[in-house]
Interface confidence: low
Amino acid sequence: EEELQVIQPDKSVSVAAGESAILHCTVTSLIPVGPIQWFRGAGPARELIYNQKEGHFPRVTTVSESTKRENMDFSISISNITPADAGTYYCVKFRKGSPDTEFKSGAGTELSVRAKPSAPVVSGPAARATPQHTVSFTCESHGFSPRDITLKWFKNGNELSDFQTNVDPVGESVSYSIHSTAKVVLTREDVHSQVICEVAHVTLQGDPLRGTANLSETIRVPPTLEVTQQPVRAENQVNVTCQVRKFYPQRLQLTWLENGNVSRTETASTVTENKDGTYNWMSWLLVNVSAHRDDVKLTCQVEHDGQPAVSKSHDLKVSAHPKEQGSNTAAENTGSNERNIY
């Protein structure tokens, strides 16, 4: 009579985490008499998964009536699969005795577990950066299996190419993590921009996971300053404006200096927002020229988002008649802060 064969028809089985895995095994003969055992792995360190004869295996059930005398199907189902269950499973026939001895093993079925990656988390630099600078963003996703995964970076829908990605661990593992770092060059128009990390994996059925970062949390657009002298309001009074344009974020403090002495300090409050997300603001200073004998140097000094102050100066000629002075550049009235300090 032909010698018993242990047949495991599936070289590999792939199961999604949480599902049940069916591992098929049939034998070609009832002889010799003896139990079937299932193991994960081979060699002395193999792990017993199921013993037909004895033991408690709560997650394992037999697919057919393995207790019947004529049964030759020893397929099993393992419930609630997790990535930790991945490995090669062997169906092994034992010859009855004291003790039972191993008679023949099947070729093995490799169980791979498909586990979804976690939602990508995108994080940017700890400190803000100004336009033209390159900043790094990182994207992390964990817990997926198998190892093959695709990660893409986008800025406002445009795919980025300057990034480096690593999948850990390098060797075999029950699940994997991906870590990617992308470099992004900031522009003055990036206040409303988004950086997106997109992860595609076999478990996601073509619907990739995305993580986003808003560049508004990363960018600092420094202001441009313009100091202008307005037409005379009243005899001996000159109105000087400091227009602070195109800055982000809003955190801004302005100080007026007259001949180097602090005249007034104020914080940007009623600002106007530009289409690109940056802000404009204007401060007025009403100067009583009759109080000055000599020419006055007016300085608008701005400290933006904790950065070193920038300033713009305007020389006020008190010797000339006020009505003949300066430019008549029209001022934006929005966000104005008018104070007569005399």
Partner: antibody, heavy 116, light 110 residues
Framework: QSVEESGGRLVTPGTPLTLTCTVS????????MHWVRQAPGKGLEWIGI?????ATSYATWAKGQFTISKTSTTVDLKITSPTTEDTATYFC?????????????WGPGTLVTVSL | QIVMTQTPFSVSAVVGGTVTIKCQAS??????LAWYQQKPGQRPKLLIY???TLASGVSSRFKGSGSGTEFTLTISGVESADAATYYC????????????FGGGTEVVVK
């Protein structure tokens, strides 16, 4: 199977230094190699790895400061611009497989002193 | 990045006693953990890998346990030759790590 480091000496800050790890009894085409250092009285600090194919990875703090390369029987660690903080015993160690996992063969170490 | 934190910094043991050293990973690293022994002036020696597997030639008095983020090295029947510094090391991954080793634990045997 053994590894041995050489090249450690007293150098002044900023002077590049190359340490060499010579292996015997196994092939670098089968095993990844690591460099680890230990400052006097301090703990072990992983510097980087060179894989069987020649690719390298470095600790975040070590990028740009160190370069790992290899020949058929040696692995080099170049300290590009040493500072006094780089004073340490430098070990090379064999990984237990091509991928990254554990260090099962270590050299005796070579001492680098960076001082003015 | 994965950070390995070892406790305590130093521990005192008596001959014949038991010492326990703990190692915590900032992320789940499964069983990818090794323990090393280093005596003063000597190279480190691999004691345990895959969290609990004894390296070749290492005494069974050394036992590793744990998985995920919490790991323990236990030395039972402490001998004077066990006086050394012990380090844990994650073998999970090396992308964007500062150090794969824990800070070390000095074992002093009285």
């Amino acid at each position: 199977q053994s590894v041995e480091e050489s090249g450690g000496r007293l150098v002044t800050p900023g002077t590049p230094l190359t340490l060499t790890c010579t292996v015997s009894g196994f092939s670098l085409s089968n095993y990844a190699m690591h460099w680890v250092r230990q400052a006097p009285g301090k703990g072990l600090e992983w510097i980087g790895i060179i894989y069987t194919g020649g690719a390298t990875s470095y600790a975040t703090w070590a990028k740009g400061q160190f370069t790992i390369s290899k020949t058929s029987t040696t692995v080099d660690l170049k300290i590009t611009s040493p500072t006094t903080e780089d004073t340490a015993t430098y070990f090379c160690a064999r990984g237990d497989r091509d991928g990254y996992a554990y260090f099962n063969i270590w050299g005796p170490g070579t001492l680098v002193t960076v001082s003015l | 990045q994965i950070v390995m934190t070892q406790t305590p910094f130093s521990v005192s043991a008596v001959v014949g006693g038991t010492v326990t050293i703990k190692c915590q990973a900032s992320h789940n690293i499964g069983s990818w953990l090794a323990w090393y022994q280093q005596k003063p002036g000597q190279r480190p020696k691999l004691l345990i890998y895959d969290a609990s597997t004894l390296a070749s030639g290492v005494s069974s008095r050394f036992k590793g346990s744990g998985s995920g983020t919490e790991f323990t090295l236990t030395i039972s029947g402490v001998e004077s030759a066990d006086a050394a510094t012990y380090y844990c090391q994650q073998g999970y991954g090396i992308s964007y790590v500062h150090n794969v080793f824990g800070g070390g634990t000095e074992v002093v045997v009285k």
